[in-house]
Interface confidence: low
């Protein structure tokens, strides 16, 4: 498992809530947490860091303390849309597909 980092300081405040620190690498676009160190996925996303799209669902329902909207994610033509790279990997487009740059300790096409 990747390292968990706990930060006690309140970095920003919103409605007097002290946000929790999610698992390192948890997707900022598709993940959230309710306990420190966890990474829970919005609908339509899966994987340990919520970076893998679920092909059977294209809708997402943002949850968590700052949710404001609900909508459907329509996958675009870009191979990196939704970031197919797991575990904090970084996606770059190639002519026919995508390439993941994996953080230390992770390997494979999608850093899994």
């Amino acid at each position: 498992d990747h390292h968990h980092h706990h930060h006690e300081q309140k970095l920003i405040s919103e409605e007097d809530l002290a946000p929790l620190v999610c698992r390192a690498g948890c997707s900022p676009e598709h993940g959230f947490c309710e306990q420190p160190g966890e990474c829970r996925c919005l609908e339509g996303w899966t994987g340990p860091l919520c970076t893998v799209p679920v092909s059977t669902s294209s809708c997402l329902s943002p949850r968590g303390p700052s949710s404001a909207t609900t909508g459907c994610l329509v996958p675009g033509p870009g191979p990196c849309d939704g970031n197919p790279c797991a575990n904090g990997g970084s996606c770059s487009e190639t002519p026919r597909s995508f390439e993941c740059t994996c953080p230390r300790g992770f390997y494979g096409l999608r850093c899994e």
Partner: antibody, heavy 120, light 106 residues
């Protein structure tokens, strides 16, 4: 509190090299990408590249790939960008940025920027 | 490469006026992020993930859009809103910014 500290200014001569620093504090430096952004006087923002300090992995714009070198020292929580063969066109403000996120929150922290002046 | 085109490049608005700045992407992106920059200062994250206001951003700001068309709206312009606004996409490499919209107060 998440902070990125950058030197205010660097003055160098054309043809020389420069290494600018970005010292991070207040978060797990190794686990979040650092981005470098260039802004020429009166111009817009230009993405240079990203570095993942935990592994040293980098992604750079084709324009800067051969001229800018991104590195990070996890022991001092400092990211660096080094330019070689400087020209006056490299004169700009260079920002480092950390996208730090947790829960449904983004905390996108920018350094104050280093103003690089390349002049003889 | 995803090219982001902002319009207008420069605009002015009177206090209380509704303002809309658009950001058009050359191909579909998942989200757009908006930054505000005042002269001589670092850009600040203003709206993230298309529609979420960053901490401290007044509620008169809003963001919307999907696919290739995004916008930032100010319901009622105030003097402190005068600044340059940039959109950015992080869906693919290379990361790209829009050219910026300079918003002035009349």
């Amino acid at each position: 509190q998440v902070q990125l500290q950058q030197p205010g200014a660097e003055f160098v001569q054309p043809g020389s090299s420069v290494k600018m620093s970005c010292k991070a504090s207040g978060y797990a430096f190794s686990d979040y990408w650092i981005t470098w952004v260039k802004q020429r006087p009166g111009q817009g923002l230009e993405w240079i590249g990203d570095i993942y300090p935990g592994s040293g992995s980098t992604k750079s714009s084709e324009k800067f790939k051969n001229r800018a070198t991104l590195t990070a020292d996890t022991s001092s929580s400092t990211a660096y960008i080094q330019f070689s063969s400087l020209t006056p066109e490299d004169s700009a403000v260079y920002y480092c940025v950390s996208l730090y996120y947790y829960g449904s929150y983004y905390l996108d922290t920018w350094g104050q920027g280093t103003t690089l002046t390349v002049s003889s | 490469q995803v090219v982001l085109t902002q319009s207008p490049a420069i605009m002015s608005a009177s206090p209380g006026e509704k303002v809309t700045i658009t950001c058009s992407a050359s191909s579909s992106v998942t989200y757009i992020h908006w930054f505000q920059q005042n002269p001589g200062t670092s850009p600040k994250l203003w709206i993230y993930r298309t529609s979420y206001l960053a901490s401290g951003v007044p509620a008169r700001f809003s963001g919307s859009g999907s696919g290739t068309s995004y916008s930032l709206t100010i319901s009622r312009m105030e003097a402190e809103d005068a600044a340059t606004y940039y959109c950015q996409q992080r869906s693919s490499y290379p990361r790209t910014f829009g050219g910026g919209t300079k918003l002035e107060i009349k």
